[in-house]
């Protein structure tokens, strides 16, 4: 575990430049010690902190669930990024589950957009070009999310 003094002059190092003059905060990748005198580094691959903080503990790294792929591993300053696997997508309104993409468009409609980890296929009426959104079956899978953060970002 690496420790870093809370001395403001030590904090002036370029990679840990303060974003506010408030004392008693530790930089991303660290949490504060119990006596508030030191910043203790998070454990790489286990936990993290993303911003200046006075956390007693770093946040646990998200573990990608089955049905997801890890696109970025957890570092001490950034949580894991999990993405729905091919053929499934995560909707904004229900980010906790990856849903199966539709396999095709209803009769009289044409596909204008493929399935991505962030969206279902998009179908429009051949003549009018009006969009169609159908019911999407849920995959029986829950996404593990990290407390305090939105369900794993999909970028």
């Amino acid at each position: 575990i690496t420790r870093q003094s809370l001395d403001p002059q030590r904090r002036a190092a370029p990679q840990q430049k303060r974003s506010s003059p408030t004392e008693g905060l530790c930089p991303p990748g660290h949490h504060i010690s119990e006596d508030s005198r030191e910043c203790i580094s998070c454990k790489y691959g286990q936990d993290y902190s993303t911003h200046w903080n006075d956390f007693l503990f770093c946040l646990r790294c998200t573990k990608c669930d089955s049905g997801e792929v890890e696109v970025n591993s957890c570092t001490t300053t950034r949580n894991t990024v999990c993405q729905c696997e091919e053929g499934t997508f995560r909707e904004e309104d229900s980010p906790e589950i990856c849903r199966k993409c539709r396999t095709g468009c209803p009769r009289g409609m044409v596909k204008v957009k493929d399935c991505t980890p962030w969206s279902d296929i998009e179908c429009v009426h051949k003549e009018s070009g009006t969009k169609h959104t159908g019911e999407v079956p849920a995959v029986e899978k829950t996404v593990t999310t990290s407390p305090g953060t939105p369900a794993s970002p999909c970028s």
């Epitope: 949490h31 007693l56 503990f57 770093c58 946040l59 646990r60 998200t62 990290s146 407390p147 305090g148």
Partner: nanobody, 124 residues
Framework: EVQLVESGGGLVQAGGSLRLSCAAS????????MGWFRQAPGKEREFVAA????????YYVDSVKGRFTISRDNAKNTVYLQMNSLKPEDTAVYYC?????????????????WGKGTLVTVSS
């Protein structure tokens, strides 16, 4: 989402011991830091103790150091507060809380979940 239910409170004489339990439902219990807080009649809620998601790191407020021990069993989705050498001033409703982390002052970070509390009364 996590639901928390405390138990183990009761009436005990000064110098006695109690073990509080906080049972959590929800598969993400082990992602959360857990804390114990207390509120004495007519007083503000006070941060007592906390531990991180793995149980490897703990924090205690000065007034309970050496007397209280916080621990967790992630397999049982339960966090405990072992209270020894109890004093009349420990009398309060004890609440358990789950959050991503806690600040030095006990402020929860991220989504936080709270139990309804269990009453501890220490008679002199």
């Amino acid at each position: 989402e996590v639901q928390l239910v405390e138990s183990g409170g009761g009436l005990v004489q000064a110098g006695g011991s109690l073990r509080l339990s906080c049972a959590a439902s929800g598969r993400t219990f082990s992602n959360y830091a857990m804390g114990w807080f207390r509120q004495a009649p007519g007083k503000e809620r006070e941060f007592v103790a906390a531990l991180n998601w793995s149980g490897g790191s703990t924090y205690y407020v000065d007034s309970v150091k050496g007397r209280f021990t916080i621990s967790r069993d992630n397999a049982k989705n339960t966090v405990y507060l072992q209270m020894n050498s109890l004093k009349p001033e420990d009398t309060a409703v004890y609440y358990c809380a789950a959050a991503g982390s806690f600040s030095l002052g006990g402020r929860p970070y991220g989504d936080d979940y709270w139990g309804k509390g269990t009453l501890v009364t220490v008679s002199s």
